[in-house]
């Protein structure tokens, strides 16, 4: 399956925080989305192979890495002034 953690996270002002996303499905592609109240999902970053990733529609204030196939952590940087949202990770073949 695919596992995202933590379920809830509080960020102190000026801090970077990292959300974990791990999958054991042997999927090449992984995605991070953000959902704000009353809105649809918006793509932050996506990755289609190891060590390669592209910006989505709202990448500013976020960073990612894809060091291995199974993992695609998202860092919410201190530059992201409005981080409060629901974050969703997904994967596909």
């Amino acid at each position: 399956g695919i596992t995202q953690s933590p379920k809830y996270l509080f960020r102190k002002e000026g801090q970077n925080v990292t959300l974990s996303c791990e999958q054991n499905l042997n999927h090449d592609a992984m995605y991070w989305y953000r959902q704000d109240p009353g809105q649809g999902l918006r793509l932050i970053y996506y990755s289609q192979i190891v060590n390669d990733f592209q910006k989505g529609d709202i990448a500013e204030g976020y960073s990612v890495s894809r060091e291995k196939k199974e993992s695609f952590p998202l860092t919410v940087t201190s530059a992201q002034k409005n981080p409060t949202a629901f974050y969703l990770c997904a994967s596909s073949i």
Epitope: I49, N51, S65, K68, S71
Partner: antibody, heavy 120, light 112 residues
Framework: QVQLQESGPGLVKPSETLSLTCTVS?????????WNWIRQFPGKGLEWMGY???????NYNPSLKSRITISRDTSKNQFSLKLSSVTAADTAVYYC?????????????WGQGTTVTVSS | DIQMTQSPSSLSASVGDRVTITCRSS???????????LHWYQQKPGKAPKLLIY???NRFSGVPSRFSGSGSGTDFTLTISSLQPEDFATYYC?????????FGQGTKLEIK
Amino acid sequence: QVQLQESGPGLVKPSETLSLTCTVSGYSITSGYFWNWIRQFPGKGLEWMGYISYDGSNNYNPSLKSRITISRDTSKNQFSLKLSSVTAADTAVYYCASPSPGTGYAVDYWGQGTTVTVSS
Amino acid sequence: DIQMTQSPSSLSASVGDRVTITCRSSQSLVHSNRNTYLHWYQQKPGKAPKLLIYKVSNRFSGVPSRFSGSGSGTDFTLTISSLQPEDFATYYCSQSTHVPFTFGQGTKLEIK
């Protein structure tokens, strides 16, 4: 900052096995990425030989497949190249290398290179 | 294997010149994920190659803006807009879309 350093004999006899080791510092080879061997012939041509992945899986250049083995020693954070049945055509500068984060497979961490001469 | 053919093999130019090096692949370098893994390296004597451009047109960290890459499919170009003394070196294109990864034969850029 990832750093790589090759070590091994500079002279190998024809028909013997070439053995080189790459010691990696600044990053664990099991944490991610692909750990490559690339060689450069005296005429300056570059050839990708193969890699060992963070999970221990291999990908080799088919032109070398019957002769090449890339393995690793995770306790020493090293990966190694063995090339059997060498001839003078295997004389080259041998580099270990790994990709830079976020560049696909584009390599930008290189060892300093070690010159291997095949001669009796 | 994908053959990578660079032209010219050598080139003489002066400081301040605009220089273009071309690289042609024997097959399309568009990956099934729609990215194109074509890269450019610079090598100076006795040193390992250095990454300049990755994925056709992305300048690597610390690479001056006078270096640019373009192209698609099978035809690619490295352009140096205004040559500086430190740019005289050998340049290689490389593809990592298809295994085995392959390199061009190199273009030696010399001072006129």
